[in-house]
C-alpha cells in the first residue's frame, strides 16, 4: 500500500504502528487495538477505528425528515468486534454478556439481550442522512457553491466516489447531506459510505483521523462553513427490530 | 472504453458566444463529474469550472462566472460548455474531463476555438 | 487561491539521465497529481495521490512530498518522456496548475 515510504506513516489513519517490515521492506500499519494490517492509501474501517479509540488512553478522544426507520447512534462509544475484514461483526457483546445485533456502521438496531440473542447477518446501513447546522453568518451560502464544495470535500478529503452523494439540501443554517450506497453499487475499493461519515464527523468534531494534515478547513468560496452542531441519521436495508417499550419511551 | 469525443474548432468574432460540447461513452455518465480546463496556446491550464453530472450541481471558477455555463444531457450523454462575451484572450484550445474520485482521470481531444475580429 | 509553482519551467536533458520536477505550493495540499501533455495532445494523468502511478505509467515514474513541497522524478529518460509536466491540486476551489515544466533533449 502507499504508506509514505520516506518516513513510514499512515496517511489516512493516525491510530496506527508503522514499521518498515512489509515485503520488501514496505511500510506497514497496523492499526491500534487489533493489530490488523491497514491499507493506508484509502480509509480505515469504521469498526477498527473504534476500537483503535478505544484502546488508546482516553485523553486521547428542501430537507428531509429522517424516517421512522432512522437510527441515531445513542449508544455512544463501545470496544466492538470486528471480523478479519474489518467489518463489524453483526453480534455485539460486552463484557457483562449483554448483547445486541448492530449494522453495517455499528449501530445498535435491536434491542439488548443475553448471549442467546441472535443477529443472523450483517445488515447494511444504505442511506446516511448527516444533519448540520452551522454558525450564524452574514447572509445565506450560495446553495450550488455549498452543495459543490460539500461534494468535492468528500470526494478529495474522504475518496468517496460522486455517485455516492445523492444530496445536498440547504435552509440556512441546516446542512444535510444524503450519502446513498446499496450492496449492488458498491464496487471492490469503493470507499464505504459508513466509513466517509464516520470520517466526516470526526473532522467536524476536530478530531481529524488523518495523519499529517490539517485539520478540516471548510469554507465556500473563501466564507468559513463553522458547524456547530451535528446529527447523523442511519438507514438500514432492513429495518431495524425494537420494542414498542423503547418505541415509546 | 472510456472516451470523451468534442466536438469540432470554432471561429468566432469578439462579443460571440462559443458552445463545446463533450460526448461521453464507456461509463455511467450520470455517476460522474465534468470538468472544463483551458489551455492558451504556448501556455498552461487552466480550471473553468466542473458540472455533477447526477445532480446538475455545478462550481464555476470566479473568473469565469458570469461568462460561463455548463450543462449536461442524460438522454445523449453529453456535457455542454458555453462562453459568452468572448474576448481575444479566450482564443484557446478547451479540454473536457472525467472526475471521480481523481480530479481528472480521461480526457476530450480538446476544441480549439479562436476569437478574432 | 492555491498557486503552485514548478521549477524549473524548462530542463534540457539526455535520454538515461535522471530528472527532478519540483512543484511548491503556496499553502499545504493533501495531494498532488502530475500529468504529463505532448504537443497537439490532451494531458495525461501521470501519478495521482503524490506518490501513486496511474495505470499503464512505467514505474521509472516516482512522486513524493507532501504538504508544500512536492517533486516529480523520472529515474532514466526515455525518448518518450521527452514533453511538458504539470502538477495539480484539489484540495480547495479552484482547482489550481502549475505552470508547467518542459523537458527538450539536449
Known amino acids: 500500500h502507499t504508506a509514505a515510504q520516506d518516513n513510514c506513516t499512515c496517511p489516512t489513519n493516525k491510530m496506527t504502528v508503522c514499521s518498515p517490515d512489509g515485503p520488501g521492506g514496505r511500510c506497514q500499519c497496523r492499526a491500534l487495538g487489533s493489530g490488523m494490517a491497514v491499507d493506508c492509501s484509502t480509509l480505515t474501517s469504521k469498526c477498527l477505528l473504534l476500537k483503535a479509540r478505544m484502546s488508546a488512553p482516553k485523553n486521547a478522544r428542501t430537507l428531509v425528515r429522517p424516517s421512522e426507520h432512522a437510527l441515531v447512534d445513542n449508544d455512544g462509544l463501545y470496544d466492538p468486534d470486528c471480523d478479519p475484514e474489518g467489518r463489524f461483526k453483526a453480534r455485539q457483546c460486552n463484557q457483562t454478556s449483554v448483547c445486541w445485533c448492530v449494522n453495517s456502521v455499528g449501530v445498535r438496531r435491536t434491542d439488548k439481550g443475553d448471549l442467546s440473542l441472535r443477529c443472523d447477518e450483517l445488515v447494511r446501513t444504505h442511506h446516511i442522512l448527516i444533519d448540520l447546522r452551522h454558525r450564524p453568518t452574514a447572509g445565506a451560502f450560495n446553495h450550488s457553491d455549498l452543495d459543490a464544495e460539500l461534494r468535492r470535500l468528500f470526494r478529495e478529503r474522504y475518496r468517496l466516489h460522486p455517485k455516492f452523494v445523492a444530496a445536498v439540501h440547504y435552509e440556512q443554517p441546516t446542512i444535510q447531506i444524503e450519502l446513498r450506497q446499496n450492496t449492488s453499487q458498491k464496487a471492490a475499493g469503493d470507499v464505504d459510505i459508513g466509513d466517509a461519515a464516520y470520517y466526516f464527523e470526526r473532522d467536524i468534531k476536530g478530531e481529524s483521523l488523518f495523519q499529517g494534515r490539517g485539520g478540516l478547513d471548510l469554507r465556500v468560496r473563501g466564507e468559513p462553513l463553522q458547524v456547530e452542531r451535528t446529527l447523523i441519521y442511519y438507514l438500514d436495508e432492513i429495518p431495524p427490530k425494537f420494542s414498542m417499550k423503547r418505541l415509546t419511551a | 472504453e472510456v472516451q470523451l469525443v468534442q466536438s469540432g474548432p470554432e471561429v468566432k468574432k469578439p462579443g460571440a458566444s462559443v458552445k463545446v460540447s463533450c460526448k461521453a461513452s464507456?461509463?455511467?455518465?450520470?455517476?460522474?463529474?465534468i470538468g472544463w480546463v483551458r489551455q492558451a496556446p504556448g501556455q498552461g491550464l487552466e480550471w473553468i469550472g466542473e458540472?455533477?453530472?447526477?445532480?446538475?450541481?455545478?462550481y464555476y471558477a470566479e473568473k469565469f462566472k458570469g461568462r460561463v455555463t455548463m450543462t449536461a444531457d442524460t438522454s445523449t450523454s453529453t456535457a455542454y460548455m458555453e462562453l459568452s462575451s468572448l474576448r481575444s484572450e479566450d482564443t484557446a484550445v478547451y479540454y473536457c474531463?472525467?472526475?471521480?474520485?481523481?480530479?481528472?482521470?480521461?480526457w476530450g481531444q480538446g476544441t480549439l476555438v479562436t476569437v478574432s475580429s | 487561491d492555491i498557486q503552485l509553482t514548478q521549477s524549473p519551467s524548462s530542463l534540457s536533458a539526455s535520454v538515461g539521465d535522471r530528472v527532478t520536477i519540483t512543484c511548491r505550493a503556496s499553502?499545504?495540499?493533501?495531494?498532488m497529481y502530475w500529468y504529463q501533455q505532448k504537443p497537439g495532445k490532451a494531458p495525461k494523468l501521470l501519478i495521482y495521490?503524490?506518490?501513486t502511478l496511474a495505470s499503464g505509467v512505467p514505474s521509472r515514474f516516482s512522486g513524493s512530498g507532501s504538504g508544500t513541497d512536492f517533486t516529480l522524478t523520472i529515474s532514466s529518460l526515455q525518448p518518450e518522456d521527452f514533453a511538458t509536466y504539470y502538477c495539480?491540486?484539489?484540495?480547495?476551489?479552484?482547482?489550481?496548475f502549475g505552470q508547467g515544466t518542459k523537458l527538450e533533449i539536449k
Open positions: 474531463a472525467r472526475g471521480s474520485i481523481f480530479p481528472f482521470d480521461y
Open positions: 464507456g461509463f455511467t455518465f450520470t455517476d460522474y463529474v
Open positions: 458540472i455533477y453530472l447526477g445532480s446538475g450541481t455545478i
Open positions: 499553502s499545504s495540499v493533501s495531494y
Open positions: 495521490d503524490t506518490s
Open positions: 495539480q491540486q484539489w484540495s480547495s476551489y479552484p482547482y489550481t
